[in-house]
């Protein structure tokens, strides 16, 4: 606001000030007089650009008039007091009401004094992020979803995510008119090494204390990717017993392990327990490949292992090392 | 036609009281400021005070608080003041004078041809 | 009270530029003084003609305009005529009242 004057009397009231569709507003407007100055106000006068006459008039003797007296109201402005504060009240948003208003005073002997305000209408937007759930495609497709509904202005969207990718933002008018719907996606290939990872929305509007942040775990749909694990190449005869592990990683989960060797059927010293293959001790060399075959949802893979099984070194008390 | 028809010459003694009229016409008296004047013989303007008509509001120049009382009928769009206690310094010619609004300042718009007031025992 | 002060009298001739001035006791004019310019004729006939410091009241030719030079308000008769002999006055505002100056005697010569 202007500071104070020193001699001349002043109009003061704020550039700008933001309102919410649908709400009610007040537009401050006051009259500062330097403490030795008289002046009288015989008449204070709302009326918006580019509008010819007034939308709202109090005179010093007939009191207030209206273009629209169920939506403004002077808030301070009384028959038979100074008049100092010009302050108008606004009812019921609309998007229409948004623009440039001037406040004046018609004083006495200074002569009219006026400032010009800018109402905002602004909307709230409501925010919702949720996954876009995806299978390994190839090619770009969107992974995540964020949307800010009916915000006026429109809101900002922004992204954050250590996997790369890039946002897809596109507009669409709101459900109450003047507001619009910010949609954004999040574009990347995908891959195994996204399932389960985060990505964050970030939407920035006007009518927010500070940016909300909507947090979105990612879902790739993807077949198992086997490997086996558990043999380090050094099993021996006459060692304790072993154990092969199926690992898999798969979205959705594995719905079943199937263990087997090239050959065939397991031979009787192997044992499957699911993912888990038991190999019992064993009295003569051995040199098997075994398969682990996992399925789920979206098809099987599998994974091979060749385990071959020395006779050790006496000097070596050490058995079949087990996982 | 915009008019500030003032009351005709007085003459009074020193002590008493005179009042003055300004019957306005043509124009919005309620919502009108009015100022009167003072001038002497040969001499520049003095300003008395102001009123305005709608309220009967009223700014009065210190020099004449106490001396000049000014009022308003708007039921006649008429303008008083009052002078007491005259004394022979308060001869001089009195207008009444309707202001004007340019927009961003007043201007003294509508002048009455004045009246003489002649204080003399 | 404050003094405001005129030149008490100013010639001139037809078509040339003339300017009144007005100085304040207190110091320097400003736009808060809302300076006043009034014509007075002969008979009493007198006439507003500035408002505010600058503000031309409705009907008053173009040649009349307000202004504050230096210090001072002042007005200023671009292209005087015969019909502009007369005295001036100005007024000022002092937060409360007007005062008014002495007048300064026009006289356009023809």
């Known amino acids: 606001w202007p500071p104070p004057g020193t001699g001349d009397i002043i109009v003061q009231a704020p550039t700008q000030v933001p309102g919410f569709l649908g709400d009610s507003v007040t537009l401050p407007c006051y009259l500062q007089v330097p403490g030795m100055e008289e002046t009288h106000v015989s008449q204070l006068t709302w009326s918006r650009h580019g509008e010819s006459g007034s939308m709202a008039v109090f005179h010093q003797t007939q009191g207030p008039n209206y273009s629209e007296p169920k939506r403004l109201e002077f808030v301070a402005a009384r028959l038979g007091t100074e008049l100092r504060d010009a302050s108008l009240r606004m009812f019921g948003l609309r998007v229409e009401d948004e623009g440039n208003y001037t406040c004046l005073f018609v004083t006495f002997p200074q002569g009219s004094r006026s400032v010009d305000i800018w109402l905002r209408v602004l909307a709230k937007p409501q925010n919702t992020a949720e996954v876009q759930k995806v299978q390994l495609t190839g090619k770009p497709v969107p992974v995540a979803r964020c949307v800010s509904t009916g915000g006026r202005p429109p809101a900002h969207i922004t992204w954050h995510s250590d996997l790369g990718g890039m946002p897809n933002t596109s507009q669409a008018p709101g459900f109450l008119s003047g507001t619009v719907t910010v949609t954004s996606l999040w574009i990347l290939v995908p891959s195994s090494q996204v399932d389960g990872k985060s990505v964050t929305c970030k939407v920035e509007h006007e009518s927010f204390e500070k940016p909300q942040l909507l947090t979105v775990n990612l879902t790739v749909y993807y077949p198992p990717e086997v490997s086996i694990s558990g043999y380090d190449n050094n099993w021996y005869l006459s060692q304790n017993e072993a154990t092969l592990t199926c690992d898999a990683r798969s979205n959705p989960e594995p719905t079943g392990y199937n263990w087997s060797t090239t050959m065939g059927p397991l031979p009787p010293f192997a044992v499957a327990q699911g993912a888990q293959l038991l190999i019992r001790p064993v009295d003569k060399p051995i040199n098997t490949t075994f398969i682990c075959n996992v399925t789920n949802a979206l098809g099987a893979r599998q994974a091979e292992l060749t385990v071959q099984v020395k006779e050790g070194p006496p000097s070596e008390p050490s058995g079949m090392s087990s996982n | 036609q915009v008019q500030m028809q003032q009351s005709g010459a007085e003459l009074v003694k020193p002590g008493a009281s005179v009042k003055l009229s300004c019957k306005t016409s043509?124009?919005?008296?309620?919502?009108?400021?009015i100022s009167w004047l003072k001038q002497k013989p040969g001499q520049s303007l003095e300003w008395i005070a102001w009123?305005?008509?709608?309220?009967?509001?009223?700014n009065y120049n210190q020099k004449f608080t106490g001396k000049a009382q000014v009022t308003v009928d708007t039921s006649s769009s008429t303008a008083y003041m009052q002078f007491s206690s005259l004394t022979t310094e308060d001869s001089a010619i009195y207008y009444c004078?309707?202001?004007?609004?340019?927009?961003?300042?007043?201007?003294?718009?509508?002048w009455g041809a004045g009246t003489t007031v002649t204080v003399s025992s | 009270q404050a003094v405001v002060t005129q030149e008490s009298a100013l010639t001139t001739s037809p078509g040339e530029t003339v300017t009144l001035t007005c100085r304040s006791s207190?110091?320097?004019?400003?736009?808060?003084?809302?300076a006043n310019w009034v014509q007075e004729k002969p008979d009493h006939l007198f006439t507003g003609l500035i408002g505010?410091?600058?503000n031309r009241a409705p009907g008053v030719p173009a040649r009349f305009s307000g202004s504050l030079i230096g210090d001072k308000a002042a007005l200023t008769i671009t292209g005087a005529q015969t019909e502009d002999e007369a005295i001036y006055f100005c007024?000022?505002?002092?937060?409360?009242?007007?005062?008014f100056g002495g007048g300064t005697k026009l006289t356009v010569l023809g």
């Open positions: 007024a000022l505002w002092y937060s409360n009242h007007f005062v």
């Open positions: 207190t110091g320097a004019v400003t736009t808060s003084n809302y």
């Open positions: 505010g410091t600058n």
């Open positions: 043509g124009f919005t008296f309620s919502s009108s400021y």
């Open positions: 009123i305005y008509a709608g309220t009967g509001d009223t």
């Open positions: 004078v309707r202001h004007g609004s340019t927009g961003r300042g007043w201007y003294f718009a509508v």
